[in-house]
Interface confidence: medium
């Protein structure tokens, strides 16, 4: 056989898809792979070739497509499971040829289960809404393509457990569920259930997400700089160690790239030739708004190092502050019986 | 007027398991603004918080008492419980249950039980 | 975990006086600070919210400031009935953490 352009497992698909659940599965090759969509490359000549391997097998076998009540069936360039069973888990391929032309690609579809409270191992969509910021929805995804626009499916959402009925904020509007105005206790889980007939038989689709209630772009204010601070004043005397914390709140802002860095005499730490260290932690509010500390620390700082300018920097998309440190050499104690005698005028 | 009242036994041995209940009337548990949370207080010191429970069964607990503390919800009942393990004398306090309200956007303990003393002795 | 700490500890004051009670975090909380009045044998009671929201039935005379990391509870004219222990609460971030109090007594 000719060679064939084989483009591997693409783990970026990840598919994982509930058992006992119709399953539509595009083949990755004209989404990502190449450059020409199915239609093209059927008025082409070229076939496309469905083919899988089993979990823990290495032989690739074909699809069964003659099961009952046609279970496995392709349509175009849409691998179709009517439902899924646990045993359909494993790597499949799609191969695009005639006599001349090759290419295929590997995807790995893992069949999971579910509790009756849609516990599982599937990975969860995470949808980020602002706190008390008006109106806000989420849709019901990945349910296109399933059942036409003639068929009118019955739409069932839960947070949890619990069916979405009666809830304070939350009002369930067919594919969308609508916060009228959202707060933290929101955050969680919600499923939407979608129910619908084909061939006389009644599907379900199960989609689950996780709401994130996260700080409104309404309260977004520029990065503040907590520490250093004009109250704290860092006197060290030559051979101790100088510790200086920046300390950033970041208001939670989409997409932001939130920066702390520090400066030494208005260079990075790495280009001065002292031995600094920079330790970084983050923690997160309840919305997702950001503390960063950075602590600049010199082990053995030397009387030049405390004359130097320390200014801690931060950024987000909200703008860019900076705060010096108020760094001293602490003045010795007197020794009494020299310096203080002598300034007593004893000889 | 929506009222806590906690309830269970005064007096636990060293070593084993603390459990409160929470009973809510005068409003319904399963409020989608509403966390329960349990906060303790030693007798002469300042307050602690040990976990909050939402309706739905989702928990949030102290670190400091995590391995140990457990809170459950009963939406029939209208009751919120916390089981303690492995009590020793420092867990002796005033137990309270509250009701946390998040209506406004910023969470607070709006409502509480009149809290339950619990002694660790033997 | 963010502490807080308040000061005073300890505050003598007359009838009439107005008092100021300082919570300090650890870290920035924006305003998701509360306030509780707490007296002996008694469950807390909800002050103030939102670092200055005043809680449905709590007194004009109570009134919270502050953003950030600096929170101030202020009584504006001391009454008979406000002598009790005062705490701050964030709701920030978890653990939910609580000041170590401060006790308003009689001069």
């Known amino acids: 056989s000719e060679r064939c352009d084989d483009w591997g497992l693409d783990t970026m698909r990840q598919i994982q898809v509930f058992e006992d659940e119709p399953a539509r599965i595009k083949c990755p090759l004209f989404e990502h792979f190449l450059k020409f969509n199915y239609s093209t490359a059927h008025s082409a000549g070229l076939t496309l070739i469905w083919y899988w391997t089993r979990q823990d097998r290495d032989l690739e076998e074909p699809i069964n497509f003659r099961l009952p009540e046609n279970r496995i069936s392709k349509e175009k360039d849409v691998l179709w499971f009517r439902p899924t069973l646990l045993n359909d888990t494993g790597n499949y391929t799609c191969m695009l040829r005639n006599t001349t032309y090759c290419s295929k690609v590997a995807f790995p579809l893992e069949v999971v289960q579910k509790d009756s409270c849609f516990n599982s191992p599937m990975k969860l969509p995470v949808h980020k809404l602002y706190i008390e910021y008006g109106i806000q929805r989420i849709t019901c995804p990945n349910v296109d393509g399933y059942f036409p626009s003639s068929v009118k499916p019955t739409i069932t959402w839960y947070m949890g457990c619990y069916k979405i009925q009666n809830f304070n904020n939350v009002i369930p509007e067919g594919m969308n569920l609508s916060f009228l105005i959202a707060f933290i206790s929101n955050n969680g889980n919600y499923t939407c259930v979608v129910t619908y007939p084909e061939n006389g038989r009644t599907f379900h689709l199960t989609r689950t997400l996780t709401v994130k209630v996260v700080g409104s772009p309404k309260n977004a204010v520029p990065p503040v700089i907590h520490s250093p601070n004009d109250h704290v004043v860092y006197e060290k005397e030559p051979g101790e160690e100088l510790l200086i914390p920046c300390t950033v709140y970041f208001s939670f802002l989409m997409d932001s790239r939130n920066e702390v860095w520090w400066t030494i005499d208005g260079k990075k730490p790495d280009d001065i030739p002292i031995d600094v260290t920079i330790n970084e932690s983050i923690s997160h509010s309840r919305t997702e708004d950001e503390t960063r500390t950075q602590i600049l620390s010199i082990k053995k700082v030397t009387s030049e190092d405390l004359k130097r300018s320390y200014v801690c920097h931060a950024r987000s998309a909200k703008g860019e502050v900076a705060k010096a440190a108020t760094v001293k050499q602490k003045v010795p104690a007197p020794r009494y019986t020299v310096e203080l005698a002598c300034g007593f005028g004893a000889t | 007027q929506l009222q806590l009242q906690e309830s269970g036994p005064g007096l636990v041995k060293p070593s084993e398991t603390l459990s409160l209940t929470c009973t809510v009337s005068g409003g319904s548990i399963s409020s989608s603004t509403y966390y329960w949370g349990w906060i303790r207080q030693p007798p002469g010191k300042g307050l602690e918080w040990i976990g909050s429970i939402y309706f739905t069964g989702s928990t949030d607990y102290n670190p400091s008492l995590k391995s140990r503390v457990s809170i459950s919800v009963d939406t029939s009942k209208n009751q919120f419980s916390l089981k303690l393990s492995s009590v020793t004398a420092a867990d002796t306090a005033v137990y309270y249950c509250?009701?946390?309200?998040?209506?406004?956007?910023?969470?607070?303990?709006?409502?509480w039980g009149q809290g339950n003393l619990v002694t660790v002795s033997s | 975990d963010i502490q807080l700490t308040q000061s005073p500890s300890f505050l003598s004051a007359s009838v009439g006086d107005r008092v100021t009670i300082t919570c300090r975090a650890s870290q920035g909380i924006s305003s998701y600070l509360a306030w509780y009045q707490q007296k002996p044998g008694k469950a807390p009671k909800l002050l103030i919210y939102?670092?200055?929201t005043l809680q449905s039935g709590v007194p004009s005379r109570f009134s919270g400031s502050g953003s950030g990391t600096e929170f101030t509870l202020t009584i504006s004219s001391l009454q008979p009935e406000d002598f009790a222990t005062y705490y701050c609460q964030q709701v920030n971030s978890y653990p939910l953490t609580f000041g170590g109090g401060t006790k308003v007594e009689i001069k």
């Open positions: 509250a009701k946390e309200d998040d209506s406004s956007g910023y969470y607070s303990f709006d409502y």
């Open positions: 939102a670092a200055s």
